[in-house]
Amino acid sequence: FKVATPYSLYVCPEGQNVTLTCRLLGPVDKGHDVTFYKTWYRSSRGEVQTCSERRPIRNLTFQDLHLHHGGHQAANTSHDLAQRHGLESASDHHGNFSITMRNLTLLDSGLYCCLVVEIRHHHSEHRVHGAMELQVQTGKDAPSNCVVYPSSSQDSENITAA
């Protein structure tokens, strides 16, 4: 399987909410001997590999934000800790995997990574990630709503998030 990032750039005004999204593509094993670990973190564009470094999102580590389930089951992060920080990560039955950030500030700007680890009970493991940029803007140049820019493999037309 692979991870797709429908949008590579999100440009949002301060105070807005945004949902960053990744999508699992390809066959996903739903057997009892496989489980999926999914999480989000901030990172930097490393020399060797983007998303190598795992920094917290609003003081929550990738371990605080992780989801853990089999196949395409739906899952949500533990609400109390994440919601106190205005965060919620979720996963649906269709391979979509997201983190919602509420009341954005300029400090939220940066590179965000989703990580999916397919863990099999016999040693083998497949680890993939996706990366996207969030720019939070303030002042007269800021958009009124979040504007999302598709990844290069998609249609390059700007799409305004609902």
Epitope: T35, Y37, V48, Q49, S52, E53, Q63, H66, H68, I119
Partner: antibody, heavy 120, light 107 residues
Framework: QVQLVQSGAEVKKPGSSVKVSCKAS????????ISWVRQAPGQGLEWMGG????????NYAQKFQGRVTITADESTSTAYMELSSLRSEDTAVYYC?????????????WGQGTLVTVSS | DIQMTQSPSSLSASVGDRVTITCRAS??????LNWYQQKPGKAPKLLIY???SLQSGVPSRFSGSGSGTDFTLTISSLQPEDFATYYC?????????FGQGTKVEIK
């Protein structure tokens, strides 16, 4: 804050077995692999095997296959490592450690270690 | 199994020195290389993960680099609390394997 607390030191006779426990607190137990790593006196670190509690079955280093059994009790957030047919060269400090995710995450939290002495 | 070879096995250095430890893997492991510090009688402590990423709470004088088969741990200015044994570890393939360790002693 995640903490791994191991059982106390043991002195065992050659040929016997030892079972070391590792109780986790402060984090999600089932999602993470717990690895067991040993260190003989003055020697380096050696991975013995690990378990992801939600699977219930463990993976072992070939060297220890057949002699080590790793189990986990999700209800008490405790992992166990049992080593049988002990010999003097099994004298070592045995550590449990948590993998950040899956089998191949780095080992970010460690227990304090349990000294097992095998002596006749 | 992937073999990890560290060099040197020991070194003597003074406070303030720049110290470099190398680790070589028997086959390519991409950037799946971690570094640990261990002091006598204590459990190892994770310093660097993914070859170059600093674990939370670790001082910035520690840095890691490398990819493929050759990796380096650097301590830019050795502090008294840095005298310890350092281990590299690969987590590219199971089983997890460690280097034999490098002991950093006071000159």
């Amino acid at each position: 804050q995640v903490q791994l607390v191991q059982s106390g030191a043991e002195v065992k006779k050659p040929g016997s077995s030892v079972k070391v426990s590792c109780k986790a607190s402060g984090g999600t137990f089932s999602s993470y692999a717990i690895s067991w790593v040993r260190q003989a006196p003055g020697q380096g670190l050696e991975w013995m095997g690990g378990i992801i509690p939600i699977f219930g079955t463990a993976n072992y280093a070939q060297k220890f296959q057949g002699r080590v059994t790793i189990t986990a009790d999700e209800s008490t957030s405790t992992a166990y490592m049992e080593l049988s047919s002990l010999r003097s060269e099994d004298t070592a400090v045995y550590y449990c450690a948590r993998n950040t995710f899956g089998w191949s995450g780095e080992l970010d939290y460690w227990g304090q270690g349990t000294l097992v002495t095998v002596s006749s | 199994d992937i073999q990890m070879t560290q060099s040197p096995s020991s070194l003597s250095a003074s406070v303030g020195d720049r110290v470099t430890i190398t680790c070589r893997a028997s086959q390519s492991i991409s950037n799946r290389l971690n570094w640990y510090q261990q002091k006598p009688g204590k459990a190892p402590k994770l310093l660097i993960y993914s070859a170059s990423s600093l674990q939370s709470g670790v001082p910035s004088r520690f840095s890691g680099s490398g990819s493929g088969t050759d990796f380096t741990l650097t301590i830019s200015s050795l502090q008294p609390e840095d005298f310890a044994t350092y281990y590299c570890q690969q987590n590219h393939d199971n089983p997890i394997t460690f280097g034999q360790g490098t002991k950093v002693e006071i000159k």
